[in-house]
């Protein structure tokens, strides 16, 4: 039975040209997190963190994505095209699969409001 819940950074905004941390957290379960997939709004995979095998950053994002912190993902050199939904998919044993959603809005530098907790200066 799946008892866990995914907590995410929710809706966040960041400056064009800046960086942002995408972060999810799985709670209320003793299940082991075996893999986390990070997916973009068009369903393309950005990166995978496998507990046994390590990180894989997909080639299209190698220059702009950094693994971590933790199971999160750091998206750098933001462009307006990065605006949209991001999904974290937690594959766990023995529970199964949990999925979280984050909405990122990339703003022109002059109007950006951002959440200090998940923003990189």
């Amino acid at each position: 039975m799946m008892t866990g819940t995914i907590e995410t950074t929710g809706n966040i905004s960041a400056k064009k040209g800046g960086s942002v941390i995408l972060q999810c957290h799985l709670s209320s379960t003793m299940a082991q997190v075996t893999q986390v997939n990070w997916e973009q709004h068009d369903h393309s995979l950005l990166a995978i963190r496998n507990a046994e095998l390590g990180w894989h950053i997909y080639p299209a994002f190698k220059d702009r994505v950094a693994p971590g912190p933790g199971l999160g993902l750091t998206l750098q050199s933001l462009t307006m095209n990065d605006t949209g939904e991001y999904f974290c998919t937690y594959h766990t044993y023995p529970d199964g699969t949990y999925r979280g959603r984050i909405f990122l809005e990339v703003l022109e530098s002059s109007v950006a409001e951002h959440s200090a907790r998940f923003q990189i200066p």
């Epitope: 082991q32 893999q35 997939n37 995978i48 496998n50 507990a51 046994e52 997909y58």
Partner: antibody, heavy 125, light 107 residues
């Protein structure tokens, strides 16, 4: 390129424990970040995943077999093994060892990349 | 547990013709799907991973497509060595599960 070779008795009596070993050559089992897996195939039937063990020692088992399965790694012998207890005739199958995730770092996928040739195990009195 | 269903169970095709094999997942597996080929008396061999990417050394006549719950393996022009059983498999959700297989036989 890593290679795998299964070994163990070809005949096991009902209610006994089936024990198989997979010997890894072409690389060190202790320095490899993979899943080491066991898969079986009853005669004339499809493939069934039995379980896997990660480099960390974490084990993952098929729920239908979990109460009877143990998978372990012996780094000193460059081997990993399968034990299946309380066997019956329905456990008669070709048993394969396999490596999962050998190309993960390069290509980002988790699949059974490398297989042993398989060993036939018959459960009969 | 994610159940993988393959169809048809048997496919009769003439050499040189196209073969289309289907695999359906009971719930979405995104693009986390692999295809294997197994010939009599041999271990399976990885053909396709990530639903559509050919494994090393696999000829271009093999192609995979699909995402979510519906997947297809296409062999564009069957060669004599392609007559075998083909299995789909989902990963990384636990437990790993395989489809029941499609046997591609000579018509």
């Amino acid at each position: 390129q890593l290679q795998l070779q299964e070994s163990g008795p070809g005949l096991v009596k009902p209610s006994e424990t089936l024990s198989l070993t997979c010997t890894v050559s072409g690389g060190s089992i202790s320095s490899s970040r993979y899943y080491w897996a066991w898969i079986r195939q009853p005669p004339g039937k499809g493939l069934e995943w039995i379980g896997s063990i990660g480099t960390s020692g974490s084990t993952y088992y098929n729920p239908s077999l979990k109460s009877r399965v143990t998978i372990s790694v012996d780094t000193s012998k460059n081997q990993f093994s399968l034990k299946l207890s309380s066997v019956t005739a329905t456990d008669t199958a070709v048993y394969y060892c396999a490596i999962e995730g050998a190309n993960f770092r390069d290509f980002g996928y988790v699949a059974f990349d490398i297989w042993g040739q398989g060993t036939m195990v018959t459960v009969s009195s | 547990e994610i159940v993988m269903t393959q169809s048809p169970a048997t496919l009769s095709v003439s050499p040189g013709e196209r073969a289309t094999l289907s695999c359906r997942a009971s719930q979405s597996v995104s693009s986390n799907l692999a295809w294997y080929q197994q010939k009599p008396g041999q271990a399976p061999r990885l053909l396709i991973y990530g639903a559509s990417t050919r494994a090393t050394g696999i000829p271009a006549r093999f192609s995979g497509s699909g995402s979510g719950t519906e997947f297809t393996l296409t062999i564009s022009s069957l060669q004599s060595e392609d007559f075998a059983v083909y299995y789909c498999q989902q990963s990384p959700p636990w437990p790993r599960t395989f489809g029941g297989g499609t046997k591609v036989e000579i018509k």
